[in-house]
Amino acid sequence: QPNNSLMLQTSKENHALASSSLCMDEKQITQNYSKVLAEVNTSWPVKMATNAVLCCPPIALRNLIIITWEIILRGQPSCTKAYKKETNETKETNCTDERITWVSRPDQNSDLQIRTVAITHDGYYRCIMVTPDGNFHRGYHLQVLVTPEVTLFQNRNRTAVCKAVAGKPAAHISWIPEGDCATKQEYWSNGTVTVKSTCHWEVHNVSTVTCHVSHLTGNKSLYIELLPVPGAKKSAK
């Protein structure tokens, strides 16, 4: 089938399990902590079903006393994962999600990984590094992005409906050409939003309408040829 000309259009982006990270490599580790302190909190959008790696401030592990990851997820008690260098012990409190783990042994790598990010991983993640020179923090407001499923269909005389179902955050829908449109949003308990745009075109020379869905995970356009008005036998351009 052609990519884009079905009477009922549907689209769901498929993402291979990709990895995303904001970590610095060892070359970027600096003894000048002022830059680290200036970058305390980061907003980080991450696509659902990918892997994410979150990093502590770039401080050499030899200077370390304690590393703590504090994880605050919606509707759950705060989870902490701590590593004490002196005794080489790790401790967890209120941590139930097995997909959130240290990347490797914390004495070798202080990074945290989330395997197969889910909507429930939306939240705040903070690494606290205790050193002889003081405490250094890096926090992440993790925003899980969900690609909406997009459909386009015609339901009445020269009226088309474009839906971006269960996206996070809400998608934005626009049309070519512009029509007489009404847009509704439906909010779901898991934090996703369905956006429904219904448009009517009175202008008789509009042949095909295009629904363009803009979203942080990527944009999608679908189009559909408008069906004739019932009873209209012969009409000239």
Partner: antibody, heavy 114, light 107 residues
Framework: QVQLQQPGSELVRPGASVKLSCKAS????????MHWVKQRPGQGLEWIGN????????NYDEKFKSKAIMTVDISSSTVYMHLSSLTSEDSAVYYC???????WGQGTLVTVSA | DVQMIQSPSSLSASMGDIVTMTCQAS??????LHWFQQKPGKAPKLLIS???NLEDGVPSRFSGSRYGTDFTLTISSLEDEDMATYFC?????????FGGGTKLDIK
């Protein structure tokens, strides 16, 4: 898969008429518009008009209103275009197109010659 | 009617070159379009649908993009078999209208 079958060529006399056919298969024939376009040798493409097989609704470009008439036979999933009062200006390849331009027939070469 | 202005009308390029051609709707009309390739004696073949969607089986060296009301077809690394005429088709308004075509030949 979607297929649009057109005869390869038609030779007609000036002043006569010709009825071009386009037989569709591989999709729901009555649910998609069928369009016709004209391509003269070495020239661009011109949209003639379209027909919706489910209701016989037609649209014609102004230029072809007195030249072309489109009809449909649902039983054979075939769309026809009747061209009348032919002149050398009508010598061209005529294509039928469906699925919003995605699928084209192979085209029929109409030659108007005495 | 919406006029589709396509440029250039012809161009010569070498194998491996990057080639671009554009289509623009008259009066800045907001439209959607397809890009086609046509070889002599053959029906046009859909390359890019809806301005930027690469059709199945079309080599990835072809791409389509849109900036406002300007549409561009790019061939990233020209091959021998790409020698053809390329044209756009706007399908938003009746009558559908075509660009004048870009005849591409290999130097």
């Amino acid at each position: 898969q979607v297929q649009l079958q057109q005869p390869g060529s038609e030779l007609v006399r000036p002043g006569a008429s010709v009825k071009l056919s386009c037989k569709a298969s591989g999709y729901t024939f009555t649910s998609y518009w069928m369009h016709w376009v004209k391509q003269r040798p070495g020239q661009g493409l011109e949209w003639i008009g379209n027909i919706f097989p489910g209701s016989d609704t037609t649209n014609y470009d102004e230029k072809f209103k007195s030249k072309a008439i489109m009809t449909v036979d649902i039983s054979s999933s075939t769309v026809y275009m009747h061209l009348s009062s032919l002149t050398s200006e009508d010598s061209a390849v005529y294509y039928c197109i469906t699925y919003t331009g995605a699928y084209w027939g192979q085209g029929t070469l109409v030659t108007v010659s005495a | 009617d919406v006029q589709m202005i396509q440029s250039p009308s012809s161009l010569s390029a070498s194998m491996g070159d990057i080639v671009t051609m554009t289509c623009q709707a008259s009066q800045g009309t907001n439209i959607n379009l397809h890009w086609f390739q046509q070889k002599p004696g053959k029906a046009p073949k859909l390359l890019i649908s809806g301005g930027s969607n690469l059709e199945d089986g079309v080599p990835s060296r072809f791409s389509g993009s849109r900036y406002g009301t300007d549409f561009t077809l790019t061939i990233s690394s020209l091959e021998d078999e790409d020698m053809a005429t390329y044209f756009c088709l706007q399908f938003t308004y009746l009558p559908w209208t075509f660009g004048g075509g870009t005849k591409l030949d290999i130097k």
